[in-house]
Amino acid sequence: SGVFQLQLQEFINERGVLASGRPCEPGCRTFFRVCLKHFQAVVSPGPCTFGTVSTPVLGTNSFAVRDDSSGGGRNPLQLPFNFTWPGTFSLIIEAWHAPGDDLRPEALPPDALISKIAIQGSLAVGQNWLLDEQTSTLTRLRYSYRVICSDNYYGDNCSRLCKKRNDHFGHYVCQPDGNLSCLPGWTGEYCQQPICLSGCHEQNGYCSKPAECLCRPGWQGRLCNECIPHNGCRHGTCSTPWQCTCDEGWGGLFCDQDLNYCTHHSPCKNGATCSNSGQRSYTCTCRPGYTGVDCELELSECDSNPCRNGGSCKDQEDGYHCLCPPGYYGLHCEHSTLSCADSPCFNGGSCRERNQGANYACECPPNFTGSNCEKKVDRCTSNPCANGGQCLNRGPSRMCRCRPGFTGTYCELHVSDCARNPCAHGGTCHDLENGLMCTCPAGFSGRRCEVRTSIDACASSPCFNRATCYTDLSTDTFVCNCPYGFVGSRCEFPVGLPPSFPW
């Protein structure tokens, strides 16, 4: 929908004559009739398919036409159309003489025509006026014209309807081409979708108007990116709503059970070492000189009988002192002043004198160690067995007892579980870290493909004429039970009509 606008600017008829050459009396009182129609290569009479318009008398003989002429006429002249502008047109402008006030065609003398011009061509929709001037032997007409779209119509041929709005159905204005231009804060095809607060979480937040962020259940925070833990969750967090993942040192469904009483309450006194031993439970290992559940009580240091080999203990301000019996020395009388003559080496150890007999050293036989060969050597202390193998002391040597699936001196070799072909019925064996897996052929299942799976031979509905189908589980084939009047392996032949075999 649009308007063809014609602006008449100046008409010159210096001699004041009609087209017939006859002069007007007293002068040519001039008005115009305009006919707008579809494009014609040669403009011919006929219906004004795009519209017509007439002016009142605009002047006598020669005159300039004002913008928006008085006397009820309008300049520019408006020729509205309610269709897609085709881009081409034909235009006929006739100047007529009006002897009286009645401008109807039937009221005018037959020779009242002053001049007639006809043009045709292309015209694109736009705001710019095209200026034209048409001259005949006696007259000259200067005018301009253009096509513009009606309100709410846009595009190259005024075919796009667009009406700006700011309501539930959309928030937009219209661009010159008729496309929607969303108002700030709105998006989407019809600008119905608000643009949420910048950074609002795409899944956990939403908005009903621009620049807000409403949180879905279980989420909170300015950008709805913080989950709300389970109600009752005390010392825990969440990564999705209503979770309760316990902080370190806490346990239980609501993370309210204290598993790290030592850290949270520091119950052990006097530098004792604290060990957690369950919920709200702990053990204090006291430093020498202290006792009590929390090592809160100070001991006499001699109470623990620190002096060995019959040494006597004497309390002192800064600790204690051991008085050793003959033949012993050291802080706790733990060292002996024995010599080889006292046979100090056990388990067949050989004694060697040192420092002119003031000291000795024991040379121990295999499997024994210690300063007096008093300790048996444990060859398993270094955990030599790999893959969970068990270490066994065997006299002077050791051996590893391997877990199933492993072999070698130290259980370091992995036995292939597939070596003994465990998969039945042609199943394919796959070695896994902790065992094996069988991939079974069609018709078999189970961990070792040992179970025969029946194939439903009736699934393809092979029986005709409403016959009942049965699967023979032993051969995976079907059998058709024919209704009365039909025969054949599929019940495909009516009785009495022999099958027409090709032989």
């Epitope: 607060l197 908005c207 620049a211 807000e212 962020c213 409403l214 949180c215 909170q220 925070g221 300015r222 950008l223 913080e226 709300i228 833990p229 389970h230 109600n231 009752g232 969750c233 005390r234």
Partner: nanobody
Framework: EVQLVESGGGLVQPGGSLRLSCTAS????????MSWVRRPPGKGPEWVSA????????YYADSVKGRFTISRDNAKNTLYLQMNSLKPEDTAVYYC????????????????WGQGTQVTVSS
């Protein structure tokens, strides 16, 4: 049953101070962001301040910035609003609430609400 109970309101002269408290029960207070909202006489509710669940992030409306301080004690299930340099325009019923939605300046939709405490600033 969820309950938010505000206290600490009263009549105070311009330039004076008040401390509002909000005690929560019926839900795990320490898991929720909290907010103070006020309704001046004859007007709609306006957001005052907010604090995140752990207490590490605080937010204030421009009108109270620098004068009011929000804080919380999760062990006591209590939210606080320390109001200094009070002005007559701070007169309102003050509510504590759990924010559910935020606008460009602060929260504007809420889940749980208290019943409110009246603060009047007048000479």
């Amino acid at each position: 049953e969820v309950q938010l109970v505000e206290s600490g309101g009263g009549l105070v002269q311009p330039g004076g101070s008040l401390r509002l408290s909000c005690t929560a029960s019926g839900f795990t207070f320490g898991n929720y962001d909290m907010s103070w909202v006020r309704r001046p006489p004859g007007k709609g509710p306006e957001w005052v301040s907010a604090i995140n669940s752990g207490g590490g992030s605080t937010y204030y409306a421009d009108s109270v910035k620098g004068r009011f301080t929000i804080s919380r004690d999760n062990a006591k299930n209590t939210l606080y609003l320390q109001m200094n340099s009070l002005k007559p325009e701070d007169t309102a019923v003050y509510y504590c609430a759990t924010p559910r939605g935020w606008g460009p300046t602060g929260p504007h939709e809420y889940g749980y609400w208290g019943q409110g405490t009246q603060v009047t600033v007048s000479s």
